[in-house]
Amino acid sequence: MMTGTIETTGNISAEKGGSIILQCHLSSTTAQVTQVNWEQQDQLLAICNADLGWHISPSFKDRVAPGPGLGLTLQSLTVNDTGEYFCIYHTYPDGTYTGRIFLEVLESSVAEHGARFQIP
């Protein structure tokens, strides 16, 4: 039975040209995290595998950095980076947990972080 909860950074905003950290945290389960995938819509950005470490998709190598922790850092942001991002936790013996983050990349300097929220 899947009892875990994913907490994410929720709805966030950042300035064009800047960087942002995407963070998820899995709690309320004793399941072992074997891998975390980071996706933008249906594109795989990066994988953090418990056995192998990090793998960044070749098309994102220049602008994506692993960490901190199981999070992901997006750099040199453009307006095209606005959209949904997903952290997908593969766990034994539970299964698959998914968290959602919405990033808005702004032209001005009024970007502020949104509130945290939880996804069951």
Partner: antibody, heavy 119, light 107 residues
Amino acid sequence: DVKLVESGGGLVKLGGSLKLSCAASGFTFSSYTMSWVRQTPEKRLELVAAISSGGSYTYYLDTVKGRFTISRDNAKNTLYLQMSSLKSEDTALFYCTRWLLSLYAMDYWGQGTSVTVSS
Amino acid sequence: DIQMTQSPSSLSASVGDRVTITCKASQNINVWLNWYQQKPGKAPKLLIYKASNLQTGVPSRFSGSGSGTDFTFTISSLQPEDIATYYCQQGQTYPFTFGQGTKVEIK
């Protein structure tokens, strides 16, 4: 070309043991999660056991826990399934499968090796 | 365990027909649904992963859709080589269960 070749199947007595092997080639074996899927005579598919790329994590179907052991030798590019205390319901065609790097699905399957448990 | 129910269990259609198979999960599985094709005497082959993503090398006449509990697999124009049994499989919760299969035949 990705190739998965199973061996070790056969006819075994009730309560007996058998060890299946899967020789992998055409890809970096040590980078992929691998598993065993069986297909019963009624054509039902079941994920029996899985093992992470480095062998740190294993999963077993409840009905085989304590009887089956999945393992891998990354130096030999080989996946194993040690089966003991075999039951008649273990009769099936056993497939060796590779998982996508994303772990979303099994993207390659071997041709299978048949296991028949008889009394 | 999550039960996966496919319908129909078998179907017969003509070459060029649009063929649709449905898969229903007993609980929410988000988009964690895969489709496999198994030709007689062969191993299953991955066609669609994560509900709608076409696996590399798979013809574009195959497609998938759905989320939550209801999913659809479509062959837009049935070809003779599509004679096979098609299985759905959920990847949300262990054990990752399969549907019972849908056998597709040519009229």
